[in-house]
C-alpha cells in the first residue's frame, strides 16, 4: 500500500506566441482546481479507460479576477498535494491524466459552472520510494509544471511497496536471509506473516495473511499432498478434502469490488466496473457529486434525481460513458463514402477522398471525363472515381492510343485460327464448327445449330466478326 502524490507548481501560458486569454474576468471571477487520474501500465487508452489505480481532486484555488489589459499570468493554485492512495503493489509503470478545471463564480443559475481548461496525459516509469520527479506538459497554449512521486505507507517498503519492514531486534544485524530496509538502515526487512499455520515447507505468501501452496500440495494451510489418481480433471489449485485438483478461486471470487461494482477477470488480476458515483481500483472512492467535477473532457455535469444517479454527465460530441471518459470511435460508423479515408480529429471528422470524389463525406462523384480525351475514336466512360475509355476496334490501352492485337486473347473457339483484320478479327473455324468465334458445332447431318448460314457462306468457311 502507498500513496501517489502530485504537486502542481504552476499553470499558465506556455512560451511562444499566441498567449491564451485569461480564463477569469472582473465580470466572471473564477478559481482553478485539478483532477488526476491514474491507470497501471503504459496504456495508450489512459484517457478513455477507468482510473483503475485511483483518482483525486484538488481543493479549489484562490478566487482570481483578471486585471484589465494584463496578459494571463500563472494562475493562483490550490494549496496542498493531490494524493491518490493505492492499496496494492505500486505497478512501476503508470499512465496519468491531469485536468485543469475552471469554476466560474458569477451569478450562475443553479450554482457554479465548471469547464475544462486543459488536459495533459502521459506514460511514465516510477519506482516507489524514489525522489520527486519533475515534469512539464503543454496543452494548447497552456503549460502545466508539476512534480510527482510514489511513496509506500509503513510498514511497506521497496520499489513496489510489497516488502514489509520492522524495527531491528538485534542492534548489529538483521535475521538470517533478511536485508536491511534501505534507506531505513535501522530497520530490517520483515518476513511476510502468512496465514497462521501455513506450512513453512509447502506454503508461501505474497501478501500478509495468505497461504499459497507449492505444486503438489493443497489445503488451506498447504499440508495436504495432492493425489491426482482419483481425480477426473486435474486443473488447478487443489481441494483440501479430496486432494484432487479442482478449479481454484478466481480473482473475482467474493467480488472485491465495493459499492456495487462488478468484477471482471483480467489476465493478471481483476478489474472493477464501478457504478456512477464511485471509482478507484475497487470502487472504494465515493460520494462524488457535481461539486467534484466528475465529468471528463468538458462534459456538463447536472445533479441526478436519485442516489444511483447522483450526477449526470452530458458529454460533448466525440465522448461517451458515465463520466464522458470514453472517446467515441466515430470512424467505426464508416461515414466516408466511396472508399474515403476517415480521420477523427477530436473536434471534427474529416474524410480524405479518393480521386474522383469530393464533399465532406466524399459523397460527390466528380465528372471523371471532364477534360479527358480518348484517342482514335474511343469514348470516355465515367465510373468508380476514374475515367475509362471504351476503345474503337483495333485500339486499346487507357487512352486508346495503343494499336490492339485482336487475336491476343485467342478469341476463336474449338481450335479456330484468328486473323487480324482492319475492322476487327476473323476466325477460320476448324471442321465441324461455325460462328463468328467458331462457338457453334455443326450437326452431323449437316444442319447447323443455328439458322441457315447467311447466303454465300458455307459452314466451315472463315466468318468475319462484324
Amino acid at each position: 500500500a502507498g500513496v501517489f502524490e502530485l504537486q502542481i507548481h504552476s499553470f499558465g501560458p506556455g512560451p511562444g506566441p499566441g498567449a491564451p486569454r485569461s480564463p477569469c474576468s472582473a465580470r466572471l471571477p473564477c478559481r482553478l482546481f485539478f483532477r488526476v487520474c491514474l491507470k497501471p501500465g503504459l496504456s495508450e487508452e489512459a484517457a478513455e479507460s477507468p482510473c483503475a489505480l485511483g483518482a483525486a481532486l484538488s481543493a479549489r484555488g484562490p478566487v482570481y479576477t483578471e486585471q484589465p489589459g494584463a496578459p494571463a499570468p500563472d494562475l493562483p493554485l490550490p494549496d496542498g498535494l493531490l494524493q491518490v492512495p493505492f492499496r496494492d503493489a505500486w505497478p512501476g509503470t503508470f499512465s496519468f491524466i491531469i485536468e485543469t478545471w475552471r469554476e466560474e463564480l458569477g451569478d450562475q443559475i443553479g450554482g457554479p459552472a465548471w469547464s475544462l481548461l486543459a488536459r495533459v496525459a502521459g506514460r511514465r516509469r516510477l519506482a516507489a520510494g524514489g525522489p520527486w520527479a519533475r515534469d512539464i506538459q503543454r496543452a494548447g497554449a497552456w503549460e502545466l509544471r508539476f512534480s510527482y512521486r510514489a511513496r509506500c505507507e509503513p510498514p511497506a517498503v521497496g520499489t513496489a511497496c510489497t516488502r514489509l519492514c520492522r524495527p531491528r531486534s538485534a542492534p548489529s544485524r538483521c535475521g538470517p536471509g533478511l536485508r536491511p530496509c534501505a534507506p531505513l538502515e535501522d530497520e530490517c526487512e520483515a518476513p511476510l506473516v502468512c496465514r497462521a499455520g501455513c506450512s513453512p515447507e509447502h506454503g508461501f505468501c505474497e501478501q500478509p495473511g495468505e497461504c499459497r501452496c507449492l505444486e503438489g500440495w493443497t489445503g488451506p494451510l498447504c499440508t495436504v499432498p495432492v493425489s491426482t489418481s482419483s481425480c477426473l480433471s486435474p486443473r488447478g489449485p487443489s481441494s483440501a478434502t479430496t486432494g484432487c485438483l479442482v478449479p481454484g478461486p478466481g480473482p473475482c471470487d467474493g467480488n472485491p469490488c465495493a459499492n456495487g461494482g462488478s468484477c471482471s477477470e483480467t489476465p493478471r488480476s481483476f478489474e472493477c466496473t464501478c457504478p456512477r458515483g464511485f471509482y478507484g481500483l475497487r470502487c472504494e472512492v465515493s460520494g462524488v457529486t457535481c461539486a467534484d467535477g466528475p465529468c471528463f473532457n468538458g462534459g456538463l455535469c447536472v445533479g441526478g434525481a436519485d442516489p444511483d444517479s447522483a450526477y449526470i454527465c452530458h458529454c460533448p460530441p466525440g465522448f461517451q460513458g458515465s463520466n464522458c471518459e470514453k472517446r467515441v470511435d466515430r470512424c467505426s460508423l464508416q461515414p466516408c463514402r466511396n472508399g474515403g479515408l476517415c480521420l477523427d480529429l477530436g473536434h471534427a471528422l474529416r474524410c480524405r477522398c479518393r480521386a474522383g470524389f469530393a464533399g465532406p463525406r466524399c459523397e460527390h462523384d466528380l465528372d471523371d471525363c471532364a477534360g479527358r480525351a480518348c484517342a482514335n475514336g474511343g469514348t470516355c466512360v465515367e465510373g468508380g472515381g476514374a475515367h475509362r475509355c471504351s476503345c474503337a476496334l483495333g485500339f486499346g490501352g487507357r487512352d486508346c492510343r495503343e494499336r490492339a492485337d485482336p487475336c491476343a486473347a485467342r478469341p476463336c473457339a474449338h481450335g479456330g485460327r484468328c486473323y487480324a483484320h482492319f475492322s476487327g478479327l476473323v476466325c477460320a473455324c476448324a471442321p465441324g464448327y461455325m460462328g463468328a468465334r467458331c462457338e457453334f458445332p455443326v450437326h452431323p447431318d449437316g444442319a447447323s445449330a443455328l439458322p441457315a448460314a447467311p447466303p454465300g457462306l458455307r459452314p466451315g468457311d472463315p466468318q468475319r466478326y462484324l
Epitope: 456495487g260 447536472v302 445533479g303 434525481a305 436519485d306 442516489p307 444511483d308 444517479s309
Partner: antibody, heavy 117, light 109 residues
Framework: EVQLVETGGGLVQPKGSLKLSCAVS????????MNWVRQAPGKGLEWVAR??????????YYADSVKDRFTISRDDSQSMLYLQMNNLKIEDTAMYYC????????WGQGTLVTVSA | QAVVTQESALTTSPGETVTLTCRSS?????????ANWIQEKPDHLFTGLIG???NRAPGVPARFSGSLIGDKAALTITGAQTEDEAIYFC?????????FGGGTKLTVL
C-alpha cells in the same frame, strides 16, 4: 422518448394476489434503478418499492406498509419491471405507477388496482 | 421514518412569483436528498419538473426552478400562469427510500 407502460391491474379480493408489469423503452434499462409508486384515491403519492441495477446486485427496498407482502423484480433482457403483490389489503387500492429517476422523474400512465370484497 | 411536509395550499395571481417549500423532519434538506418536484394535473397526469434539487427537466418552462432555501427544498414559479394550477409534490431520498410530501394545491386566480 422514454416510455413506461404498466399493465396487470384489476379487481382482486382481500388476501388475493396480483402481478403488475411495466414495459420500458427508449433508454438503457439495465443501467438504472427502478421504482413503484402508488396513489390511493383522493390521496397523495406513496413510494412502494425500489430495485437497483445488476452492478448493485439488484438490491431491493420496500416501504414499511408493503414489506413482506410485495416483491419487486426486473428482467433486464426484456426491459421489464414487475411487482408481485400478495396478501392484498383494502388499503392497497390505488393507481400504481412505474417510476424511473434519472435527471428528473419519469412516469408511466399507471394501472389501477382495486382490492374489494 | 422521515416525514416530509409541504404547504397544503397556496394561491397566487398570474404573473406573480410563488415559492413552494419542502421540509424534512430529520433536519435540513441537502443535495444528498436529491429533491424532486412533480406536478399532478387532473386525470392522474404526472410530470417530473425538477430532479436533483435544481435540475429542470427537458421541456419544462424556465419559470420553474428548484433550489435549497435555508433548511428546505423550494420550487419557485417566476411569473405564474393559469395553466400552472395543479398539485405539486416534492420527494426526498433518504438513502434508498423515497418519501413524498403531502402535496401543495396551487391555485392561480
Amino acid at each position: 422518448e422514454v416510455q413506461l407502460v404498466e399493465t396487470g391491474g384489476g379487481l382482486v379480493q382481500p388476501k388475493g394476489s396480483l402481478k403488475l408489469s411495466c414495459a420500458v423503452s427508449a433508454f438503457t434499462f439495465t443501467t438504472y434503478a427502478m421504482n413503484w409508486v402508488r396513489q390511493a384515491p383522493g390521496k397523495g403519492l406513496e413510494w412502494v418499492a425500489r430495485i437497483r441495477n445488476k452492478s448493485n446486485n439488484y438490491a431491493t427496498y420496500y416501504a414499511d406498509s408493503v414489506k413482506d407482502r410485495f416483491t419487486i423484480s426486473r428482467d433486464d433482457s426484456q426491459s421489464m419491471l414487475y411487482l408481485q403483490m400478495n396478501n392484498l389489503k383494502i388499503e392497497d387500492t390505488a393507481m400504481y405507477y412505474c417510476v424511473f429517476y434519472y435527471d428528473h422523474v419519469y412516469w408511466g400512465q399507471g394501472t389501477l388496482v382495486t382490492v374489494s370484497a | 421514518q422521515a416525514v416530509v411536509t409541504q404547504e397544503s395550499a397556496l394561491t397566487t395571481s398570474p404573473g406573480e412569483t410563488v415559492t413552494l417549500t419542502c421540509r424534512s423532519s430529520t433536519g435540513a434538506v441537502t443535495t444528498s436528498n436529491y429533491a424532486n418536484w412533480i406536478q399532478e394535473k387532473p386525470d392522474h397526469l404526472f410530470t417530473g419538473l425538477i430532479g436533483g434539487t435544481n435540475n429542470r427537466a427537458p421541456g419544462v418552462p424556465a419559470r420553474f426552478s428548484g433550489s435549497l432555501i435555508g433548511d428546505k427544498a423550494a420550487l419557485t414559479i417566476t411569473g405564474a400562469q393559469t395553466e400552472d394550477e395543479a398539485i405539486y409534490f416534492c420527494g426526498l431520498w433518504y438513502s434508498n427510500h423515497l418519501v413524498f410530501g403531502g402535496g401543495t394545491k396551487l391555485t392561480v386566480l
